[in-house]
């Protein structure tokens, strides 16, 4: 399954929107910084394309879920958030098309399930952090920056998979 070129452009637009969403400086939130334990090993180069697509899909689905809550809507600019949803939705569609084509369905299912679980736990930690910090502006900024970094890393993986073909 070949992800369309528009998928890469969409990823870049998503990162750009995340950057534009910034309301306060991360530098002002030093005391609120947290290591969420991004499961980088689940996005390692040892993965085959077939194994990464469901993990990437899970990552984007979780980002969508995180930013489509009531608390998120109150924290971010509505226009930017709507554009952000649209980009994520398009990427989910692209990845779902690959999953439907049966890519990797029979390959290392346990490995994939473990990876998807690791991504879910990562987002659970983020959600718990926001709750503990009472969804403060600094907590949301720390999370926005974290999602930018982790999404960027997963985007880099997509690019490296594309270049290996």
């Amino acid at each position: 399954c070949d992800l369309p070129q528009t998928h890469s452009l969409g990823s870049r637009r998503t990162l750009m929107l995340l950057a534009q969403m910034r309301r306060i400086s991360l530098f002002s939130c030093l005391k609120d910084r947290h290591d969420f334990g991004f499961p980088q090993e689940e996005f390692g180069n040892q993965f085959q394309k077939a194994e990464t697509i469901p993990v990437l899909h899970e990552m984007i689905q979780q980002i969508f879920n995180l930013f489509s809550t009531k608390d998120s809507s109150a924290a971010w600019d509505e226009t930017l958030l709507d554009k952000f949803y649209t980009e994520l939705y398009q990427q989910l569609n692209d990845l779902e098309a690959c999953v439907i084509q049966g890519v990797g369905v029979t390959e290392t299912p346990l490995m994939k399930e473990d990876s998807i679980l690791a991504v879910r736990k990562y987002f659970q930690r983020i959600t718990l952090y926001l709750k503990e910090k009472k969804y403060s502006p600094c907590a949301w900024e720390v999370v926005r920056a974290e999602i930018m970094r982790s999404f960027s890393l997963s985007t880099n993986l997509q690019e490296s998979l594309r270049s290996k073909e």
Epitope: L18, A19, R22, S25, L26, F27, S28, L30, R33, H34, D35, F36, G37, F38, Q40, A145, E146, M148, R149, S150, S152, L153, N156
Partner: antibody, heavy 120, light 107 residues
Framework: EVQLLESGAEVKKPGGSLRLSCAAS????????MSWVRQAPGKGLEWVSA????????YYADSVKGRFTISRDNSKNTLYLQMNSLRAEDTAVYYC?????????????WGQGTLVTVSS | DIQMTQSPSSLSASVGDRVTITCRAS??????LNWYQQKPGKAPKLLIY???NLQSGVPSRFSGSGSGTDFTLTISSLQPEDFATYYC?????????FGPGTKVDIK
Amino acid sequence: EVQLLESGAEVKKPGGSLRLSCAASGFTFSSYAMSWVRQAPGKGLEWVSAISGSGGSTYYADSVKGRFTISRDNSKNTLYLQMNSLRAEDTAVYYCARVDSSSSLHFDYWGQGTLVTVSS
Amino acid sequence: DIQMTQSPSSLSASVGDRVTITCRASQRIGTYLNWYQQKPGKAPKLLIYAASNLQSGVPSRFSGSGSGTDFTLTISSLQPEDFATYYCLQTFNTPFTFGPGTKVDIK
């Protein structure tokens, strides 16, 4: 084009004072945190201090706390480091650096450095 | 304070070699880790930010990986202009701290 230009080299006696300045151009100065980093001759890099874009938040290394003060004048696009009670161990090349905080915190642009020598 | 250690402290390599430098933090710092290159008499130059992001204009032979406490800078094929000293920097907490540096020289 982003440019950071530190003031000229200085020689001071122990116990003396000095103010370093760093003139910034090519970007919206007030939107960025700024930092000072130093390097003693033949040694590694040491972070000294940082200041938020508005100037409201400042941070210092323990080695300079209480002696050095970081400040900025956003109307003049200039960063400062006021150095008091200078010691021989403050002898170093001092760099000013811009802090990018869009997704992480990193010093993306640096000045050319200015040598401060503290000697009797 | 967060301590940063780097290994090796120096290495000799030839043009075309694959070079790996590691940096370890004394506590978890997420991906708040940056890599710099410095040549004698020059200001440091940002290579990698947020552990794995290549700074604009930096050749793709440089790459970074890691999160938490262990990080790696890799130069896939060493070029003549890459002989320099490399530093890691954590910006998770103040005081921000640099690693002691790794000097890469010609074998």
